[in-house]
């Protein structure tokens, strides 16, 4: 059974994941982002179901494509590079989903834009956090 300290740790990790996903989304949605139109042409796989931490496997599998799309913003001077953000997200995802059980991700039939993809995982984080508080 999860202890209050492990629940607190999970909540903090989810909050950090949420913050970095929101940061990426904000940067993409910035009206001054000249690469937004091109970024929106890339398609991402969406999870068929995302209600438990094990479903983060579906996010993990899309992190490399996400980094590649974010690298389109190469004309900017980065405080944080896309690889810094993706690396941190990857570490959090691995800790949250655990490695005890192998979960095969099932994807929805329709793909999504980067904005829809990020919004989906932001909603996931918010939903899980709400069950922990």
């Amino acid at each position: 059974a999860p202890t209050s300290s492990s629940t607190k740790k999970t909540q903090l990790q989810l909050e950090h994941l949420l913050l970095d996903l929101q940061m990426i989304l904000n940067g993409i949605n910035n009206y001054k982002n000249p690469k937004l139109t091109r970024m929106l042409t890339f398609k991402f796989y969406m999870p068929k179901k995302a209600t438990e931490l094990k479903h983060l496997q579906c996010l993990e599998e899309e992190l490399k494509p996400l980094e590649e799309v974010l690298n389109l913003a190469q004309s900017k001077n980065f405080h944080l590079r896309p690889r810094d953000l993706i690396s941190n997200i990857n570490v959090i995802v691995l800790e949250l989903k655990g490695s005890e059980t192998t979960f095969m991700c099932e994807y929805a039939d329709e793909t999504a834009t980067i904005v829809e993809f990020l919004n989906r995982w932001i909603t996931f984080c918010q939903s899980i956090i709400s069950t922990l508080t």
């Epitope: 970095d20 904000n26 940067g27 405080h79 896309p82």
Partner: nanobody, 119 residues
């Protein structure tokens, strides 16, 4: 408006340590990047370390393994622990607050704190 107050600079011998702090106040959003840049006389401003509110960090090779950035989101404060300092680390260190991971005209900068590494 965002106000940034830096502290912790000073004179230190080569091989020594210093800890810089920067507290942000004003129109702070929960999603942000805070960090440190430095500028030595006659040189361009350069990144020292940056950290997102979610914990993502960036260090240039010149400080990797020697400097550690951390933050307290509840206090809107960022810290820079500088170990194994070298004379070439001498510069004015500026705290930075940004709403995105890339540079923007809406970024905010502190007044700067002098770090001098000399025997």
């Amino acid at each position: 408006e965002v106000q940034l107050v830096e502290s912790g600079g000073g004179l230190v011998q080569p091989g020594g340590s210093l800890r810089l702090s920067c507290a942000a106040s004003g129109s702070i959003f929960s999603i942000n990047v805070m960090g440190w840049y430095r500028q030595a006389p006659g040189k361009q401003r350069e990144l020292v370390a940056a950290i997102s509110s979610g914990g993502s960090t960036n260090y240039p090779d010149s400080v990797k393994g020697r400097f550690t950035i951390s933050r307290d989101n509840a206090k809107n404060t960022v810290y820079l622990q500088m170990n194994s300092l070298k004379p070439e680390d001498t510069a004015v260190y500026y705290c930075m607050y940004a709403s995105s991971w890339y540079e923007d005209e809406t970024d905010y900068w502190g007044q700067g704190t002098q770090v001098t590494v000399s025997s």
